[in-house]
Amino acid sequence: AHHHHHHGENLYFQGSERNIDDCPNHRCQNGGVCVDGVNTYNCRCPPQWTGQFCTEDVDECLLQPNACQNGGTCANRNGGYGCVCVNGWSGDDCSENIDDCAFASCTPGSTCIDRVASFSCMCPEGKAGLLCHLDDAGNS
């Protein structure tokens, strides 16, 4: 079939039909890209959006049950999603163990060991207690 495109008027000739390029007047939303159709247009949506005009939010929580790790709760949002992490975890997908040692108050000279949502202090000789703040009576 004869196919001709006249750039000045955005006209396509397919056989004996005249098909106008509908993309100049498109209304693709949320980053959608217009793709001309026969007497209409379609929208190619970014991953976070769907629907004929990219107006429907994709529910990533439904599509990716493991979007949030380590017990985090997935919260769908317009154009994306977020994770509500349980204590001890952080990051976009709750995959990062919070460094509890950064806020720990182990006595100087002791060694902090990071755990999930907690920390422990490894005491040097002669010290005891959770924070190694006590003198170890056994070593006196």
């Epitope: 498109h26 209304r27 939303q29 959608g32 004929q52 107006t55």
Partner: antibody
Framework: EVQLVESGGGLVQPGGSLKLSCAVS????????MEWVRQASGKGLEWVAA??????????VYSASVKDRFTISRDDSKSTLYLQMNSLKTEDTAVYYC???????????WGQGTLVTVSS | DIQMTQSPSSVSASVGDRVTITCQTS??????LAWYQQKPGKSPKLLIY???RLQDGVPSRFSGSGSGTDYTLTISSLQPEDFATYYC?????????FGGGTKVEIK
């Protein structure tokens, strides 16, 4: 909170020019289509011009009644939309509204409007 | 351009009444229809988008329906604050076009 505030309206003679501004806040300006809509006194709403978002290269569309006379533009650094109106006619007299196209094929936020009067 | 035929142009009703406004488009707009409320001296306010979806903060007495070329806005039980002018608008393609408006007046 999404806010749109128009300014720049006033009285102008036929053939004259005027530049309207619309300062926006509360959202990422470049992510949204922005529109100008007008309303003559006691009449209905008439769409004037649109500028698409960054994802659509900020492309522009005009109504037939203002094409070649009006120019829509935006300054992302100032979060401001503009409407430059040249060769004004008496029939351009109206309240001009700036609105946000909220990604739903609908205008979900509007400014308070600014009155443009074209009269000799 | 897509033509919008809105009816009636005005309606007199009482508080508690059910009010129905219709909008017909000259071609299929694939449910790309919005409804707005406008009060004198104020900006339009979005009520319904996507033909049937209620905008955040809009009372549930407002509802929209329709597809193709025929659309309806219904106010199930008219309240004193609902007396205003209502407009339909197609968002399928530019130029955006609005219906002529329906003024809801107190009977």
């Amino acid at each position: 909170e999404v806010q749109l505030v128009e300014s720049g309206g006033g009285l102008v003679q036929p053939g004259g020019s005027l530049k309207l501004s619309c300062a926006v806040s509360g959202f990422t300006f470049s992510d949204f289509y922005m529109e100008w809509v007008r309303q003559a006194s006691g009449k209905g709403l008439e769409w004037v011009a649109a500028q698409r978002n960054k994802a659509n290269d900020f492309s522009i569309v005009y109504s037939a009644s203002v094409k070649d006379r009006f120019t829509i533009s935006r300054d992302d650094s100032k979060s401001t939309l503009y409407l430059q109106m040249n060769s004004l006619k008496t029939e351009d007299t109206a309240v001009y509204y700036c609105s946000r196209d909220g990604g739903k094929l609908a205008l979900d936020a509007w400014g308070q409007g600014t009155l443009v009067t074209v009269s000799s | 351009d897509i033509q919008m035929t809105q009816s009636p142009s005005s309606v007199s009703a009482s508080v508690g009444d059910r009010v129905t406004i219709t909008c017909q488009t000259s071609e299929d707009i694939y449910s790309g229809l919005a409804w707005y409320q406008q009060k004198p001296g104020k900006s339009p306010k979005l009520l319904i988008y996507g033909a049937s979806r209620l905008q955040d903060g809009v009372p549930s007495r407002f509802s929209g329906s329709g597809s193709g070329t025929d659309y309806t806005l219904t106010i199930s039980s008219l309240q004193p604050e609902d007396f205003a002018t209502y407009y339909c608008q197609q968002g399928f393609k530019y130029p955006l076009t609005f219906g002529g408006g329906t003024k809801v007046e107190i009977k």
